[in-house]
Every structure is written in C-alpha cells, then in structure tokens.
C-alpha cells in the first residue's frame, strides 16, 4: 500500500511539475521591467524566452517574437535548450511511469519490469527537474549580473546596437513558476525512485515447506528435488503463502484467470 501511494504521489507531483515547466517555458514574463525608479510608467516591458512584450497604459499589449537564432545571446539559447530538454525528458518520464504504475495492469508485465520502469521514470523526472532549475537559475543569474539586455536592441537597424536608455529588468513570474515546477518534478522523481525499491522483487530466504512423501515422514526443503517436486522452477519469484496477513505491497500480484474479467 505504501509503495503504491508513494509511486502514485510521485507520478502526480511530477505531472504537476512538468505542467509547470511547460507553463514557465511558454510564459512571457521571464524578466519584467524594474519599476523601482519609475513606478508610474505608461509603458511596461516584459520578456520571455521566445518573445518580448510591451503593455501600454491604453490596455494594448504588443509582443514581438525573436525572429533570429544567431542574433540571440548564447545564454538565452542555453536556457531554451535546458527547458526543452527538461520538458522532453519529463514527457517521456510521464509516459514510462504511466505503464509502471502498480495500479495499472498491462498484460503479464513482471513486477521487476515495473520496478525498472519506475526507476527509469524517476531518474528522468530528477534530470528534468534539474534541467528546469538550471535553466531558470542561469536566466536569473543573467538578470542579476546585468548581462541580460533587451533582445530587440541587439539586432535593430543595420545590425548595430541601439545604446539608448536601457530598461532595467528584474525577475518575472516565470522564474518562480520554473523554480517551483522544477522542484516538484525533482521531488516526484525521488519519490518514484523510492517506490521502485519497494516494487523490486526480493531474493529472500523462502520459508521451508513440509513435503510429505508417501509412507515417509520426512521434511524436504524446496529446491532439493527439482524434477519431482516442481518447487525449484516455480518458487524463485514467489513467496510461499503461510497463512499470515500480508499488505497489498507485500504480496506480489501475478496475472491469473480472474485478472481479465
């Protein structure tokens, strides 16, 4: 039960995190105009990874895409790449984790396969979260160190740079969304990895089973007579039911004729 809950919660947390990473990547407010010196501007500037926008007092908002690749700062390109890698890994991780969920039965999938898939998706979520956090942090660092400049200024006119009054930018909402989303994805990934440990079939010391041969009162241990007892081939991945209470997670579920009603 605990493993299922951990896995399910990890999946949900990662799902929310990846949705947040996608939202942050698409948002325009990665950097917003610093209003400290001019709180009553009639023109408010904000910028995203893909376009820069201007919201006027009139209510009109104008956005211009960055229609260049070579003209953009390398750091911005790096942030874009990190966020996209994070989204792609997260999306693949989600796909894998859906099939790995203990509550979902797909054919005769072994628990070991589910455990491996859970671990794989967990690692993907961790890397995805780290990519997002790294991307957002790189961008934040660009802002803090004043390397971030209005992209529109970088390729106006005849390739020259307009060095007029530079608008100062501060952290936008997308940065906080990205940090939180990356953190959630990371936490979700860790939870999936923890769940994987609980899902993995244990190579345990199996309890002895009394086997009464005809006419003799001799106890045999499983594996001794593989050909005649049939235990050797079958018990390796099974716990022998001894009548004791078991949690849902302790009893490994295998397909039976009742599973496909």
């Amino acid at each position: 039960m605990a493993v299922t809950a951990c896995q399910g919660l990890g999946f949900v947390v990662s799902l929310i995190g990846i949705a947040g990473i996608i939202a942050a990547t698409c948002m325009d407010q990665w950097s917003t105009q610093d209003l400290y010196n001019n709180p009553v501007t009639a023109v408010f500037n904000y910028q995203g990874l893909w376009r820069s926008c201007v919201r006027e007092s009139s209510g009109f908002t104008e956005c211009r895409g960055y229609f260049t690749l070579l003209g953009l700062p390398a750091m911005l390109q790096a942030v874009r790449a990190l966020m996209i890698v994070g989204i792609v890994l997260g999306a693949i991780g989600l796909l894998v984790s859906i099939f790995a969920l203990k509550c979902i039965r797909i054919g005769s999938m072994e628990d070991s396969a589910k455990a491996n898939m859970t671990l794989t998706s967990g690692i993907m979520f961790i890397v995805s979260g780290l990519c997002a956090i790294a991307g957002v942090s790189v961008f934040a660092n660009m802002l803090v160190t004043n390397f971030w400049m209005s992209t529109a200024n970088m390729y106006t006119g005849m390739g020259g740079m307009v060095q007029t009054v530079q608008t100062r930018y501060t952290f936008g909402a997308a940065l906080f969304v990205g940090w939180v989303a990356g953190g959630l994805t990371l936490i979700g990934g860790v939870m999936m990895c923890i769940a994987c440990r609980g899902l993995a079939p244990e190579e345990t010391n199996y309890k002895a089973v009394s086997y009464h041969a005809s006419g003799h009162s001799v106890a045999y241990k499983p594996g001794g007579f593989k050909a005649s007892t049939g235990f050797g081939s079958n018990t390796k991945n099974k716990k022998i039911y001894d009548g004791g209470a078991r949690t849902e997670d302790e009893v490994q579920s295998y397909p039976s004729k009742h599973d496909y009603v």
């Epitope: 023109v43 820069s52 007092s57 009139s58 211009r64 529109a152 307009v162 009054v165």
Partner: antibody, heavy 120, light 113 residues
Framework: EVQLVESGGGLVKPGGSLRLSCAAS????????MSWVRQTPEKRLEWVAT????????YYLDSVKGRFTISRDNAKNTLYLQMNSLRAEDTALYYC?????????????WGQGTLITVSS | DIVMTQSPDSLAVSLGERATINCKSS????????????LAWYQQKPGQPPKLLIY???TRESGVPDRFTGSGFGTDFTLTISSLQAEDVAVYYC?????????FGAGTKLEIK
C-alpha cells in the same frame, strides 16, 4: 461615431466640491483607458488623471492627488471626476479624453469640455 | 516629471511654405522594448478640443493629411507641415505618452504670414 460629452462644471468656492461626468458612446467603453485633461486660462494643457479599462489602475497628477478621484461605471458608459478641496488654480476647462488602443497612449478622442471656475 | 519644451512659441509662415515645430523632452521617450517613441502631436483650433495628429512620434492618425509629418527620436522631436494651408492655423502641442504624468508642451501658435 465616438462621442464624449462632459457635464457637471460650474462656479464653485475654494474648498468646495464638484463631480464631473463624461457620457461616452459609439465605442466599447469598458475596453478603453480614459483620462481627464484640463486647459488653464493661459491655454496650457495639463493631464489630470487616468483610469484603465477595468478600473483597476488609476493615475493622478501630483497636485490633485488626494483631492480628486477618477472613477468609471462601465455599465452606464460614464467616466467621473470627483473634485474635493478645490483651489483657484483648479480653474480650467476640463476635457474627458479616450486613450487610443493602438495609438501609443495618445488621446485620440476628446469631448468639448466643461468649464470649472473656482472663485470666492 | 518629464518637462516638454516647445519652440518656437509662435510661428508665422506663408501659405504653401514649410512650417517646422520642435519639441524637446527632459527624458527619453524611446522605449527599447518595442523600439517606439512615445510622443504625440495635437492640433487645437479656437473653440475646439485638441485633435490628435501624430502618435508614436511619426505615425499619422487616420484622416490626417499627409502634409503633416512627425519625426525625431529619444528626446528631440519635430512636427513638419510641408505646405501650409489656411486651415492649419492653430496651436500645436506635443505630449509625453511614456511616463506619468503625461505632460504637454506649452504649445506653438501657428499663423499665416
């Protein structure tokens, strides 16, 4: 046709109050940012206050801050300017103006104005 | 506050001649975010409210004759009437549309010589 009609002007004593109204028609009033601009007897134009479409943001000239309040009733397509603690220097012709959506914050339509005289 | 300084205070030009009005702002009206200058020009005839002629420093408002041209960048702007007509006699104002308060110039009175 866009029309802005101001009303509520008149003669008022210093320290008195007055409420100006601006009835708008011919456009979707709630979409537009609206302003009050006054013209002094010396013919100088002075922006007084602005309110954005939804009414969430308001901006005022420092000299009228705390005395004047700009508001709007989008259901009635009406802009208001509540003026308290009036002074002699508030004497002017008050215009209601619309901020054009794509006109870089410029005022594209103006009313005919309503005259306010503050005198004892 | 941004101070808008217009020159000259008054101007007398012959019909058909070019009229030039200047406007200088104490701070830049250029916005780097969209590469636009936030300056407007208005025309006011006696007994009438101001009428928008030019916005964004150089864009003519619809219905404004093409003899009216706005130019300039940052802090220095110009309104040019290429061939003065009798109906152009008015007072012309420039306005800062970039930062509150939205200040106006003192106006330039244009007359026929």
């Amino acid at each position: 046709e866009v029309q802005l009609v101001e009303s509520g002007g008149g003669l008022v004593k210093p320290g008195g109050s007055l409420r100006l109204s601006c009835a708008a028609s011919g456009f979707t009033f709630s979409t537009y940012t609206m302003s009050w601009v006054r013209q002094t007897p010396e013919k100088r134009l002075e922006w007084v206050a602005t309110i954005v479409g939804g009414g969430g943001y308001t901006y005022y000239l420092d000299s009228v801050k705390g005395r004047f309040t700009i508001s709007r009733d989008n259901a009635k397509n009406t802009l208001y300017l509540q003026m308290n603690s009036l002074r002699a220097e508030d004497t002017a012709l008050y215009y209601c103006a619309r901020m054009g959506l794509t006109q870089r914050n410029a005022l594209d339509y103006w009313g005919q104005g309503t005259l306010i005289t503050v005198s004892s | 506050d941004i101070v808008m300084t217009q020159s000259p205070d008054s101007l007398a030009v012959s019909l058909g001649e070019r009229a030039t009005i200047n406007c200088k702002s104490s701070q830049s009206l250029f916005n780097s975010g969209n590469q636009k200058n936030y300056l407007a020009w208005y025309q006011q005839k006696p007994g009438q409210p101001p009428k928008l002629l030019i916005y964004g420093a150089s864009t003519r408002e619809s219905g404004v004759p093409d003899r009216f041209t706005g130019s300039g960048f940052g802090t220095d702007f110009t309104l040019t009437i290429s061939s003065l007509q009798a109906e152009d006699v008015a007072v012309y104002y420039c306005q800062n549309d970039h930062t509150y308060p939205l200040t106006f110039g003192a106006g330039t009175k244009l007359e026929i010589k």
